[in-house]
């Protein structure tokens, strides 16, 4: 039975040219995480694997940085980065947990800058 829950940064916005941290946390389960994948729509951005560590997709290498933790930092944001992002936790024995974040990249300085995700 899958008892875990994924907490995410939810809906966030950031300015064009800036950077943002995407963060998910899996809790309420003692399942062990073996891999965390980050996807934008159907495109793989990055994987953090228990054995191999981080792998950033070649097409995103210049603009994606691993961390903090199992999160992902997106840099040099463009309006085209607006959209859904998914963190996919592969765990044993529970299986797969998925969290969703919606990022809106704004042209103006009206955007709220995404701060590092913190649990109170």
């Amino acid at each position: 039975m899958m008892t875990g829950t994924i907490e995410t940064t939810g809906n966030i916005s950031a300015e064009k040219g800036g950077s943002i941290i995407l963060q998910c946390h899996l809790s309420s389960t003692t399942a062990q995480v073996t891999q965390v994948a980050w996807e934008q729509q159907d495109q793989l951005l990055a994987i953090c694997n228990a054995d191999l560590g981080w792998h950033i997709s070649p097409s995103f290498k210049d603009r994606v940085a691993p961390g903090p933790g199992l999160g992902l930092t997106l840099q040099s944001l463009t309006v085209n980065d607006t959209g859904e992002y998914f963190c996919i936790y592969h765990t044993y024995p529970d299986g797969t947990y998925t969290g969703r974040i919606f990022l809106e990249v704004l042209e103006s300085s009206v955007a709220e800058h995404g701060a590092r995700f913190q649990i109170p």
Epitope: T34, P68, G69, Y92, I119
Partner: antibody, heavy 119, light 113 residues
Framework: EVQLVESGGGLVKPGGSLKLSCAAS????????MSWVRQTPEKRLEWVAY????????YYPDTVKGRFTISRDNAKNTLYLQMSSLKSEDTAIYYC????????????WGQGTTLTVSS | DIVMSQSPSSLAVSVGEKVTMTCKSS????????????LAWYQQKPGQSPKLLIY???TRESGVPDRFTGSGSGTDFTLTISSVKAEDLAVYYC?????????FGGGTKLEIK
């Protein structure tokens, strides 16, 4: 150089409380999961508490659940273990140990601090 | 809980000899999706804290001499020291990190004749 230095051990009466600390240096503390592992007088090793890198997840074995609380202050690079309702079987050397994200073995250990629970 | 059993509990060998110690788990430590065995070996010298030797059952930690070799899969694991040195005097522990609570074997004490 990775360093983990435990402190706070001592002699406590059964039912008493104590808080252990572990000062970390030589690495990015907030990028690592951490645990406390104890070694009994019989030299057996027992894992007693785990905390994730950002502090959002904590796990304990049944032997200490409800009595021990692990916490961390990433700004101070310090790990803590608050122990209450102590029993004689909690007597041990307590080590803090570092864990790489997604890898649950202990890649660095401190030198340990000794807790003795006795009346 | 997964029970880890080590044997022998102690052994005495001469410098230069080959040593083999075993660790058995009550459940398989092999995770099928990544084909990794979630088992580690530690060395604890007298008066010191434990030191990581081997993880994923067979991967040597950086800086560990190549005379130390981990092998095995599933429930049966072995730590081999190909040619013992006097400095290898220690207790060797296995640990499973496959599932909570993480558990250790009782240790194998290596003494030098």
């Amino acid at each position: 150089e990775v360093q983990l230095v435990e402190s706070g051990g001592g002699l406590v009466k059964p039912g008493g409380s104590l808080k252990l600390s572990c000062a970390a240096s030589g690495f990015a503390f907030s990028d690592y999961d951490m645990s406390w592992v104890r070694q009994t007088p019989e030299k057996r090793l027992e894992w007693v508490a785990y905390i994730s890198d950002g502090g959002y997840n904590t796990y304990y074995p049944d032997t200490v659940k409800g009595r021990f609380t692990i916490s961390r202050d990433n700004a101070k690079n310090t790990l803590y273990l608050q122990m209450s309702s102590l029993k004689s079987e909690d007597t041990a050397i307590y080590y803090c140990a570092r864990q790489i994200l997604l890898r649950y073995y202990f890649d660095y250990w401190g030198q340990g601090t000794t807790l003795t629970v006795s009346s | 809980d997964i029970v880890m059993s080590q044997s022998p509990s102690s052994l005495a060998v001469s410098v230069g000899e080959k040593v083999t110690m075993t660790c058995k788990s009550s459940q398989s430590l092999l995770y099928s999706s990544n084909q990794k065995n979630y088992l580690a070996w530690y060395q604890q010298k007298p008066g010191q804290s434990p030191k990581l030797l081997i993880y994923w059952a067979s991967t040597r930690e950086s800086g560990v001499p190549d005379r130390f070799t981990g092998s095995g899969s599933g429930t049966d694991f072995t730590l081999t020291i190909s040619s013992v040195k006097a400095e290898d005097l220690a207790v060797y522990y296995c640990q499973q990190y496959h599932s909570y609570p993480w558990t250790f074997g009782g240790g194998t004490k290596l003494e030098i004749k």
